[in-house]
């Protein structure tokens, strides 16, 4: 039993480290392998994830991580029983995937104005929670051309545009993501989309 | 929001030895070290120690070793630290502090006299 | 404890800018990270900087901090008169043990 592509991981900065690596052939993660996870701090102890299956010779393990800060540092055993696989470090402040945010809401009693509010998905006392930018993705469900990036570039966490940019009459979704340039993350994943019926007066014409 | 409390003002003789708490509420108990520093009146800041409440394990400054100890009951949230063999220098606010590399809240301070 | 210096006193009027210099060795600041403390007459400490330059929510960003080489920076610009306290520095070093030392501590005065 080999490594065939060694564990790359991916931290929320908050309580989880993603890590996923395949094997050399097909294998049942969660009972022939073992992913052990020790923050290189005084007094720190080693937790064990138990890695699930992903895809045939594909392993992810979901590693739980208390008070993620910039100065931290993982050691990271892969065994398989008693032989130890491979052996690397993690540094979550360099591999950051921030969490999506929730609870995406469009608002369409503003008199022609769309108003789409979205939870920022970290708590205050969070480095993250003040540093977050959002990408929020608007499309047609009739027009797939009909497809619209606005950057959020401000804190807060909203957006508002016209009505009147976007057809009246049809129905529309849109969803929301976020990262944070002072660790340079990548991007979340996408919100769950949400959905409206865009109708708007329009304008009388002469 | 966080709250560290800690016990009230203490009087001891020289020889004798304290036990100072500091109650936590407001996060995960467990899934934050726990510090201890004293401040002797009018001088600055000093670390005597640190404590991690998941497992109880602990690291004491060199100049403490052998008269410190530091415990917690994660039952009621609390860490204890109990300086031994007292002497008129330990008098100071000690203080309880929460944090990792450095300490993000404090307790309110538990000023320890040690007077004959 | 390694020893962290600081300036005994500073002192500037009210809007003015001061900043508070914490020195150490290599082992400590230059191969950590620096926290910076506020402690208001009377009260407890209370942390204003950490990682070198990040502010904890409801820090205001007329406080910051900088770290180069064994030498970090506390600024403090728009002085006000609730500024006035002790302020002390802190890291932590793991040579040849673990332990977290504080910087001499610096009284500012705002005149």
């Known amino acids: 039993m080999k490594v065939l592509q060694e564990p790359t991981c991916v931290s929320d900065y908050m309580s989880i480290s993603t890590c996923e690596w395949k094997m050399n052939g097909p294998t049942n993660c969660s009972t022939e392998l073992r992913l052990l996870y020790q923050l290189v701090f005084l007094l720190s102890e080693a937790h064990t994830c138990i890695p699930e299956n992903n895809g045939g010779a594909g392993c992810v393990c979901h590693l739980l991580m208390d008070d993620v800060v910039s100065a931290d540092n993982y050691t990271l055993d892969l065994w398989a029983g008693q032989q130890l696989l491979w052996k690397g470090s993690f540094k979550p402040s360099e591999h950051v995937k921030p969490r999506a945010p929730g609870n995406l809401t469009v608002h369409t009693n503003v008199s022609d104005t769309l108003l789409l509010t979205w939870s920022n998905p970290y708590p205050p006392d969070n480095y993250l929670y003040n540093h977050l930018t959002y990408a929020v993705n608007i499309w047609s469900e009739n027009d797939p051309a009909d497809f619209r990036i606005y950057n959020v570039t401000y804190l807060e966490p909203s957006l508002r545009i016209a009505a009147s940019t976007l057809k009246s009459g049809i129905s529309y979704r849109a969803r929301v993501r976020a990262w944070a340039q002072c660790y340079n993350t990548t991007w979340s994943e996408w919100s769950p989309s949400t959905k409206w019926h865009n109708s708007y007066r329009e304008p009388f014409e002469q | 929001q966080v709250q560290l409390v800690q016990s009230g003002a203490e009087v001891k003789k020289p020889g004798a030895s304290v036990k100072v708490s500091c109650k936590a509420s407001?996060?995960?108990?467990?899934?934050?070290?726990m510090h201890w520093a004293r401040q002797a009146p009018g001088q600055g800041l000093e670390w005597m120690g640190i404590i991690n409440p998941s497992g109880g394990s602990t690291s004491y400054a060199q100049k403490f070793q052998g008269r410190v100890t530091m415990t917690r009951d994660t039952s009621t949230s609390t860490v204890y630290m109990e300086l031994s063999s007292l002497r008129s220098e330990d008098t100071a606010v000690y203080y309880c502090?929460?944090?990792?590399?450095?300490?993000?809240?404090w307790g309110n301070g538990t000023l320890v006299t040690v007077s004959s | 404890l390694p020893v962290l210096t600081q300036p005994p006193s500073v002192s500037a009027a009210p809007g003015q800018k001061v900043t508070i210099s914490c020195s150490g060795g290599s082992s400590s600041i230059g191969n950590s990270y620096v926290s910076w403390y506020q402690q208001l007459p009377g009260a407890a400490p209370k942390l204003l900087i950490y990682d070198n330059n990040k502010r904890p929510s409801g820090i205001p960003d007329r406080f910051s901090g900088f770290r180069s080489g064994t030498s970090a920076t506390l600024a403090i610009t728009g002085l006000q008169t609730g500024d006035e306290a002790d302020y002390y520095c802190?890291?932590?070093?793991?040579?040849?043990?673990?332990?977290?030392?504080f910087g001499t501590g610096t009284k500012l005065t705002v005149l």
């Open positions: 802190g890291t932590w070093d793991t040579s040849p043990v673990w332990e977290w030392p």
């Open positions: 502090a929460r944090g990792k590399y450095w300490m993000y809240d």
């Open positions: 407001g996060y995960a108990f467990t899934s934050y070290y």
